[in-house]
């Protein structure tokens, strides 16, 4: 019965899943961008280093209407321990420049692959 | 409707200085964080500076740190980037923008040639 009912009601996605997911998500973003992304907006690079699903929430979180992201801003939100909200920044999160969303995700897709590659998956 | 009007460019010397203006409308500006990013000839957009909805917090990009002042009167709804020791890489077309939401609201711009 126990084991059924962990059928019946999923549990938690294992890390490996919920990164792999995440990079086809960014990879479809990428492949299918036929007008500048989210009309050219621009959003505060981040550190791909501690924090990074954090602080790439924090970043992302403050371009609204933009529906080619919405999906990797929930995405985003199952790897970020903390609520994150527009406008918010950690101490994590150096504000030294600003690029494109789409540079901004293709410069997370690279690093998210390699840490795939490598096994990191948390 | 968002609406942003960029003002103050023009031809000048390198080593000159320009004031740059913006005027907002359609939005309530003092609540928003503000860009101003450039495009120079044949270049894709470059991001100059930010600033906070109070006006306290400012950011630049390291090309123009020390050399640009964004500021904002929230009073007038109006943007600044005062713009001193001007080289000649820094000719380009600047676009006030309402942060996070693209060229969609940009305005027209203001060219800056710097040449001698």
């Known amino acids: 019965l126990t084991c059924l009912g962990g059928f019946a009601s999923p549990g938690p996605v294992p890390p490996s899943t919920a990164l792999r997911e995440l990079i086809e998500e960014l990879v479809n973003i990428t492949q299918n961008q036929k007008a500048p992304l989210c009309n050219g907006s621009m959003v505060w690079s981040i550190n791909l280093t501690a924090g990074m699903y954090c602080a790439a929430l924090e970043s992302l979180i403050n371009v609204s209407g933009c529906s080619a992201i919405e999906k990797t801003q929930r995405m985003l939100s199952g790897f970020c321990p903390h609520k994150v909200s527009a406008g918010q920044f950690s101490s994590l999160h150096v504000r030294d420049t600003k690029i494109e969303v789409a540079q901004f995700v293709k410069d997370l897709l690279l690093h998210l692959k390699k840490l795939f590659r490598e096994g990191q998956f948390n | 409707e968002v609406q942003l009007l960029e003002s103050g460019g023009g031809l000048v010397q390198p080593g000159g200085s320009l004031r740059l203006s913006c005027a907002a409308s359609g939005f309530t500006f003092r609540d928003y964080e503000m860009d101003w990013v450039r495009q120079a000839p044949g270049k894709g957009r470059e991001w100059v500076s930010s600033?906070?909805?109070?006006?306290?917090?400012?950011y630049y990009a390291d090309s123009v740190k020390g050399r640009f002042t964004i500021s904002r009167d929230n009073s007038k709804n109006t943007l600044y980037l005062q713009m001193n020791s001007l080289r000649a890489e820094d000719t380009a077309v600047y676009y006030c923008?309402?942060?996070?939401?693209?060229?969609?609201?940009w305005g027209q711009g203001t060219l800056v040639t710097v040449s001698s």
């Open positions: 600033i906070g909805p109070g006006g306290s917090e400012t």
């Open positions: 923008a309402k942060a996070y939401t693209g060229f969609k609201y």
